[in-house]
């Protein structure tokens, strides 16, 4: 498979936001790239979000997506929002070179995202 690199561990902010870079080694000059974030919990794999972009253009996720991102060359900067403690898990970056042919696929080893719910503020007298 195509080589895909991503950090091993990321800690989400107190506001439930986690960011990481997904970098891939392209064999050629792809013009259309699809990036998918998958969450693996136990043996279950679910799709978190996905975006297709043209090289040189911005990465656009659906309006209701919890992900946002920017692209630069063979790097994609991904941000996942609205995370809670129960969302702690392994987040895998999947990269597909869609056009021109041939099709190339790469799967990262995953980024373990730790999410800690903030303590509620104590009541003030």
């Amino acid at each position: 498979a195509m080589h895909v690199a991503q950090p091993a561990v990321v800690l989400a902010s107190s506001r439930g936001i986690a960011s990481f870079v997904c970098e891939y080694a392209s064999p050629g000059k792809a013009t259309e790239v699809r990036v998918t974030v998958l969450r693996q919990a136990d043996s279950q794999v679910t799709e978190v979000c996905a975006a297709t972009y043209m090289m040189g253009n911005e990465l656009t996720f659906l309006d209701d997506s919890i992900c946002t991102g920017t692209s630069s060359g063979n790097q994609v900067n991904l941000t996942i929002q609205g995370l809670r403690a129960m969302d702690t898990g392994l987040y895998i970056c999947k990269v597909e070179l869609m056009y021109p042919p041939p099709y190339y696929l790469g799967i990262g080893n995953g980024t373990q995202i730790y999410v800690i719910d903030p303590e509620p503020c104590p009541d003030s007298d």
Partner: antibody, heavy 115, light 107 residues
């Protein structure tokens, strides 16, 4: 127009050697990983070998059935990929296809291993 | 190594029928699955790539679906021209194993 043209097939005795060539045109050869796939008579498709390109340090991969006997190589200056086949067995008989990462395929060349 | 279990091995259907071929993998291949069409005496042709994407020049009667370990190739309305053997293939990692093939015939 994309073209992959295999050559070098023929009749060879068990234990013998043969070298297949595949000439590519119509696409950027050096951007692609190249593969050899075969089809034995009455059997299905079998992936044999892959050679990646310069960004991947020309890494090679082989199926267990040919590892140690077959060698894949490429020459980007000639837009060509090769399969050196040694210690041939009768079960290596079949049509051999070269393919650019499975998107583009050649017409195939027949290798017959028989005494 | 990733094992590919393709079924059925052969199939006879009538013109206009909806046809389904399945491929099961021994482990999650994350959608890294291609389908090929091989007509008698011809080279294989890429039909579907990445589990769901129709290859250029192939009829929209063909569609691919699936994820994880279970994948499906569907022909919405069988044409006489669809007589061929169909193969699935793992393209996630080496060895890039093919399924055993499904020979499709017209009744």
């Amino acid at each position: 127009e994309v073209q992959l043209v295999e050559s070098g097939g023929g009749l060879v005795q068990p234990g013998g050697s043969i070298r297949l060539s595949c000439a590519a045109s119509g696409f950027t050869f050096s951007d692609n990983w190249m593969n050899w796939v075969r089809q034995a008579p009455g059997k299905g498709l079998e992936w044999l070998a892959q050679i990646r390109n310069k960004p991947y340090n020309y890494e090679t991969y082989y199926s267990d059935s040919v590892k140690g006997r077959f060698t894949i190589s490429r020459d980007d200056s000639k837009n060509s990929v090769y399969l050196q086949m040694n210690s041939l067995k009768t079960e290596d008989t079949g049509v051999y296809y070269c393919t650019a990462q499975f998107a583009y395929w050649g017409q195939g060349t027949l290798v017959t291993v028989s005494s | 190594d990733i094992q590919m279990t393709q079924s059925p091995s052969s199939l006879s259907a009538s013109v206009g029928d909806r046809v389904t071929i399945t491929c099961r993998t021994s482990e999650n291949i994350y959608g890294g699955l291609n389908w090929y069409q091989r007509k008698q005496g011809k080279s294989p042709k890429l039909l579907i790539y990445g589990a769901t994407n129709l290859a250029s020049g192939m009829s929209s009667r063909f569609s691919g679906s699936g994820s994880g370990t279970d994948y499906t190739l569907k022909i919405s309305s069988l044409h006489p021209d669809d007589v061929a053997t169909y193969y699935c293939q793992n393209v996630l990692r080496s060895p890039f194993t093919f399924g055993s093939g499904t020979k499709l015939e017209i009744k």
